[in-house]
């Protein structure tokens, strides 16, 4: 059956032979209606990439550099299955390219000029492409030929496989630049030995190199890693201090109509029958015909790449930056230490319009990028299409798990001038009901619920976390009879109450009328029994404070708070009647952009912050007629975080624990991708 067939692309006679054997052996173990293998032979991996894009083949396994080529237009391929190494219990699908130095040296990443460098080999990922790609814009001009620019940047190097005649400085630390183990400084162990012997000041290797060469922790403690933010960390902190995370070997397919489920079904069955130590007749991860045919011989199995993970996310911002610099050879005109405009990520068109107005008023210091959901915005910040946005705590958690960092906190209670340096305790997550109802915290089952959005703190994580510990399952859509929780599955009962309009029904952005704090309260006013919001929501939308038709006649006393002990209290008493304290919303960014974002935002709030009194004829950053566009409307200022500069420290142990527990109920495709 052609639609059940996976056309595997082979790049040599030997691969084609193994592919035919793969095809025949899979036929013998799979049912006739199951997936089948067909083999397509091409001259090179690039030809395979083109063939898949043209729908002449379906899959091929590629090294990281080729995954980058496969992702570029017009190919537009995406990773679907990853090879893993090590054990099934602790599968390794990535390695980390690192810069190792001796602990007793005193320079940082931005002080490498004039140092001596040790590389694994010319053109190799960890030893050359990544470090030189990331340093590319610091190299002296002209940057071509690249070897000459590198020779002039370092004071001496060992770059195995380089041309020692044309570029003698690259072979200064290893005469002749031998391209095999005859050169004592060749490859990973050699580059590390070059550093260890004192020949070089820095070695560009894999994170595992240090552990493979130094079994003794005391010896390893003599070395450190250089981080991209110009700090240092110990060698076992490579996950937080590396030049790039590099995928090892990956199966790619078309982004649209790519048969990824079929490819996974095929490879999953293949590893069951012909994986490591499974069969004498045919081995997936070895071959009598040659090395690394179709798959790496060192692979132990396959893992499905989460569907939300596109090539940009899979390869990572640092890796793509390095490879793009090397390939395109272009550098920004401004020096790299100068802050370029900050690209703010706006949710849908309401936020985009406010962002555009901010952009005009900032004289272009702010630029705007749009996405339809918060998770799409986070992904854009991760891959460099955007730089920053302000997020509810639930999304600060997801952003943190995806490698972003909190930069500034929204403050709601501290009057100026102390505001900028004050760390507030947070706001209260509350459950609001109509005074006329007889609801309590203990009889919510079967009622109609209103939520700000799935994954947000007051509207979801806190109430559903508390509910989970009571009901011990994740079927929240069965607990409530119906509700509006934007971001839920469209056919879920938790989308039934949403107002839309139609194509935007239950979407987690302002196009859905019941989205956010104000939206969830409106949902309660018009349709629901209980709304999960922040403690300020009712006062901010009653007594004529919200001029919209649905809100202008609402009275604060017509609403009450549910307390966890089963009682109810006035909305004026949130301190004595709340579900939990929630961390304030915070601005997040990539680590490399955090300082620029902070500096620019502090400057912008001085011009457009809460000191502006007349928002009808001036631009106000923290005002959007109760719509909470870009920032919460009740923000007084954006405040420095001081030492709370990681998502764990910012959110606090208790909240992180609560969200981590809720992860078993997670519907976040982005979180799944970021924890792959």
């Amino acid at each position: 059956v052609p639609e059940k067939s996976v056309r595997w692309c082979a790049v040599s006679e030997h691969e084609a032979t193994k592919c035919q054997s793969f095809r025949d052996h899979m036929k013998s173990v799979l049912p006739s209606n199951g997936p089948s293998v067909a083999c397509v032979k091409k001259a090179s991996h690039l030809d395979c990439i083109r063939a898949i894009a043209a729908n002449e083949a379906d899959a091929v396994t590629l090294d990281a550099g080729l995954v980058y080529d496969a992702y570029l237009a017009p190919n537009n391929l995406k990773p679907v299955v990853a090879e893993f190494y090590g054990s099934k219990e602790d599968p390794q699908t990535f390695y980390y390219a690192v810069a190792v130095v001796k602990k007793d040296s005193d320079f940082q990443m931005n002080q490498l000029r004039g140092r001596k460098s040790c590389h694994t080999g010319l053109g190799r990922s960890a030893g050359w492409n990544i470090p030189i790609g990331l340093l590319y814009c610091d190299l002296p001009e002209p940057r071509k030929p690249l070897e000459k620019a590198v020779a002039n940047f370092f004071s001496g190097s060992c770059v195995p496989c380089a041309d020692g005649t044309d570029f003698p400085q690259l072979c200064q630390l290893c005469p002749g630049c031998g391209c095999s183990t005859l050169n004592q400084y060749f490859s990973y162990s050699g580059a590390f030995k070059c550093l260890k012997d004192g020949a070089g000041d820095v070695a560009f290797v894999k994170h595992s190199t240090i552990f493979e060469n130094l079994a003794n922790k005391a010896d390893r403690d003599q070395y450190e890693l250089l981080c991209l933010d110009n700090t240092r960390k110990s060698v076992d902190e490579y996950k937080d201090c590396h030049l790039a995370r590099v995928p090892s070997h990956t199966v790619v397919a078309r982004s649209v109509g790519g048969k990824e489920d079929l490819i996974w079904e095929l490879l999953n069955q293949a590893q069951e029958h012909f994986g490591k130590d499974k069969s004498k007749e045919f081995q997936l991860f070895s071959s009598p015909h040659g090395k690394d045919l179709l798959f790496k011989d060192s692979a132990h199995g396959f893992l499905k790449v989460p569907p939300r993970m596109d090539a940009k996310m899979y390869l990572g911002y640092e890796y793509i930056t390095a490879i793009r610099n090397l390939r395109e050879g272009t550098c920004p005109e401004a020096p790299t230490d100068e802050c370029k405009p900050v690209k703010w990520c706006a949710l849908s068109h309401h936020e985009r319009l406010k962002c555009d107005e901010w952009s005009v008023n900032s004289a272009g210091k702010i630029e705007c990028e749009s996405a339809e959901t918060t998770e799409d915005c986070i992904a854009k910040i991760m891959n460099g299409e955007a730089d920053a946005m302000s997020l509810d705590g639930g999304f600060v958690y997801i952003a943190g798990m995806c490698g972003l960092v909190p930069v500034l906190a929204e403050n709601y209670n501290t009057p100026n001038p102390n505001c900028e340096n004050t760390a507030e305790e947070g706001y209260f997550a509350v459950a609001v009901v109509k005074s006329s109802s007889d609801l309590t915290w203990d009889n919510l089952k079967g009622k109609k619920s209103c939520h700000t959005a799935v994954g947000r703190t007051a509207g979801w994580n806190i109430p559903m976390g508390l509910l989970y510990s009571k009901i011990n399952h994740c079927r929240f859509d069965e607990f409530f009879s119906e509700g509006c929780a934007p971001g839920s599955e469209k056919n879920s009962s938790l989308c039934k109450l949403c107002m839309g309009p139609s194509p935007n029904l239950c979407e987690p952005n302002n196009k859905e009328g019941y989205y956010g704090y104000t939206g969830a309260f409106r949902c309660l006013v018009e349709k629901g029994d209980v709304a999960f919001v922040k403690h300020q929501t009712v006062p901010q939308n009653t007594g004529g404070k919200n001029p919209d038709a649905w809100a202008k006649n609402l009275k604060e006393e017509d609403y009450e708070l549910l307390c966890l002990d089963g009682s109810r209290k006035s909305v004026q008493e949130p301190a004595n009647c709340h579900l939990a304290r929630a961390p304030n919303h915070a601005v997040v960014a990539r680590k490399d952009k955090a300082d620029c974002v902070q500096t620019l935002l502090l400057d912008q709030q001085r011009m457009f912050g809460s000191s502006v009194t007349d928002c009808s004829s001036n631009f106000c950053l923290f005002e959007s007629k109760t719509k909470d566009l870009l920032f919460r409307d009740d923000t007084v200022c954006l405040a420095k975080l001081h030492d709370r500069n990681t998502y764990e420290k910012y959110l606090g142990e208790e909240y992180v624990k609560a969200v981590t527990n809720l992860r078993k109920c997670s519907t976040s495709p982005l979180l799944e991708a970021c924890t792959f």
Partner: nanobody, 117 residues
Framework: QVQLVESGGGLVQPGGSLRLSCAAS????????MAWYRQAPGKQRELVAG???????TYAGSVKGRFTISRDNAKNTVYLQMNSLKPEDTAVYYC???????????WGQGTQVTVSS
């Protein structure tokens, strides 16, 4: 809330010029930010240029150096001078004062600009 009416569009050859006008039904002196947007078929509406009351201007990267936004508060009009026009500038051009945009997508009729040989 003032009504805005766009005019000045038309068919022009590549390399040619046009001047768009946006006339307001009331005073724009107290309006902080005025801007021109455009929307090409099948594309999202995008900011082309903006101007604040104090005269601060911002331009989309694709029009920098070719387009100039200005405002005449006495005439309650905002202008967009478009030079060195390219086929990719073809779109409906809209003017906004941002006053109602936080509530709903309120836009006027716009004015069609077509750049073609």
């Amino acid at each position: 809330q003032v009504q805005l009416v766009e005019s000045g569009g038309g068919l022009v050859q590549p390399g040619g010029s046009l001047r768009l006008s946006c006339a307001a039904s009331g005073s724009i002196a107290s309006i902080n930010t005025m801007a021109w947007y455009r929307q090409a078929p099948g594309k999202q509406r995008e900011l082309v240029a903006g101007i604040t009351r104090s005269g601060t201007t911002t331009y989309a990267g694709s029009v920098k150096g070719r387009f100039t936004i200005s405002r005449d508060n006495a005439k309650n009009t905002v202008y967009l001078q478009m030079n060195s026009l390219k086929p990719e500038d073809t779109a409906v051009y809209y003017c906004t004062d941002y006053s109602s945009s936080y509530y709903q997508d309120y836009w006027g009729q716009g004015t069609q600009v077509t750049v073609s040989s």
